[in-house]
């Protein structure tokens, strides 16, 4: 099939980085600067993506691959292929329409992006709060109150036998 196709379509012989030039009797012409073709047999070259403004060039455009952008410091990527840049906030904040706002009591955000999430409810798992939550950190749940009552024995399971030939991690 490939052989038949190449006999029928001379464009299939044009490699990546070139295009099949109808103006020149369907010969393979190189993509001009600021354009690319990432696959063979293309009839046009695509214009390179420009990383401008809040976007920053992560990978330069070449004749065979598009430019890749990321975001300038203080912003982070959103969307496929970093199609948008969104402002960073501090830990303990979330981005709203009015800018960065502190997390409400009972919620936290340990990243510079995303929304504030509720603290873990330890009691749902029958556990108690070992370390209180903050705007930046979730609560740390500990053993259940019953486990901590006087006379409760702490049972430690035996360590698993080490397999021969494996060093400890």
């Amino acid at each position: 099939f490939e052989r038949t196709r190449s006999l029928q379509d001379p464009c299939s012989n044009c490699p990546a980085g070139t295009f099949c030039d109808n103006n020149r009797n369907q010969i393979c012409s190189p993509c001009p600067p600021n354009s690319f073709s990432s696959a063979g047999g293309q009839r046009t070259c695509d214009i390179c993506r420009q990383c401008k403004g809040v976007f920053r060039t992560r990978k330069e455009c070449s004749s065979t691959s598009n430019a890749e952008c990321d975001c300038t410091p203080g912003f982070h990527c959103l969307g496929a292929g970093c199609s948008m840049c969104e402002q960073d906030c501090k830990q303990g904040q979330e981005l709203t329409k009015k800018g960065c706002k502190d997390c409400c009591f009972g919620t936290f955000n340990d990243q510079k992006r995303g929304i504030c999430r509720p603290w873990t409810n330890c009691s749902l798992d029958g556990k108690s709060v070992l370390v209180n939550g903050t705007k930046e950190r979730d609560v740390v749940c500990g053993p259940s109150p019953a486990d901590l009552s006087p006379g409760a024995s702490s049972v430690t399971p035996p360590a698993p036998a080490r397999e021969p030939g494996h060093s400890p991690q």
């Epitope: 980085g17 190189p30 600067p33 600021n34 390179c48 330069e60 455009c61 070449s62 004749s63 065979t64």
Partner: antibody, heavy 116, light 112 residues
């Protein structure tokens, strides 16, 4: 490595072709640039051939130079030399295959003297 | 065409001193600027690319800065081996004029 050759004394109007021979890398991966330097003067960009074969000349060239490429060489033809074309001609390799590249591997240059 | 204007044409400084060379582009070239050092009888040597990134094996005494149209090369703790001519070059391939590899006129650095 990159090595220029073909520089010599020529009379005005006699076409001359300089050759840049490369080894240790592929011209299908890197761009190559031609630059010249007249005695006691600065560097002057002549043209570039990209990894995919696209050739671009500086606008001042206006047909005075022709760049060509084979699998292991890049040619520079001075179509009708004048005395102003007396210079050392350098060939250099790009650092990568991108359009906006820079040049980090240079030949020692070849001297062209145009005189009657 | 993109025109690169380099100043000064020549500068003299003592060993241990600091030299600053400026390069101005006639249109914005983002950070697509390289700096080269050339000594007599030798080809140019890449010092800095992308306006501020030091090329491999180059001393940290060389510092590039700037973006858009204004760029600077600073050589600190000057050594006698730094005596050379320095050139800026745009590598902005895709300007409207496609004249994207133009050099500045050069700056001769004389070390006393």
């Amino acid at each position: 490595s990159v090595e220029e050759s073909g520089g010599r004394l020529v009379t005005p109007g006699t076409p001359l072709t300089l050759t840049c021979t490369v080894s240790g890398f592929s011209l299908s991966t890197y761009a190559m640039i031609w630059v010249r330097q007249a005695p006691g003067k600065g560097l002057e960009w002549i043209g570039v051939v990209y990894d995919n074969g696209y050739i671009s000349h500086a606008t001042w060239v206006k047909g005075r130079f022709t760049i060509s490429k084979t699998s292991t060489t890049v040619g520079l033809e001075i179509t009708s030399p004048t005395t102003e074309d007396t210079a050392t001609y350098f060939c250099a390799r790009s650092a990568d295959g991108s359009w906006s590249t820079y040049f980090n591997l240079w030949g020692q240059g070849t001297l062209v003297t145009v005189s009657s | 065409d993109i025109v690169m204007t380099q100043t000064p044409a020549s500068v003299e400084a003592a060993v241990g001193g600091t030299v600053t060379i400026k390069c101005q582009a006639s249109e914005s070239i983002s950070n697509y600027l390289a700096w080269y050092q050339q000594k007599p009888g030798q080809p140019p040597k890449l010092l800095i690319y992308k306006a501020s990134t030091l090329a491999s094996g180059v001393s940290s005494r060389f510092k590039g800065s700037g973006s858009g149209t204004e760029f600077t090369l600073t050589i600190s703790d000057l050594e006698s081996a730094d005596a050379a001519t320095y050139y800026c070059q745009t590598n902005y391939c895709c300007s409207s004029s496609d004249n994207g590899f133009a050099f500045g006129g050069g700056t001769e650095v004389v070390v006393k």
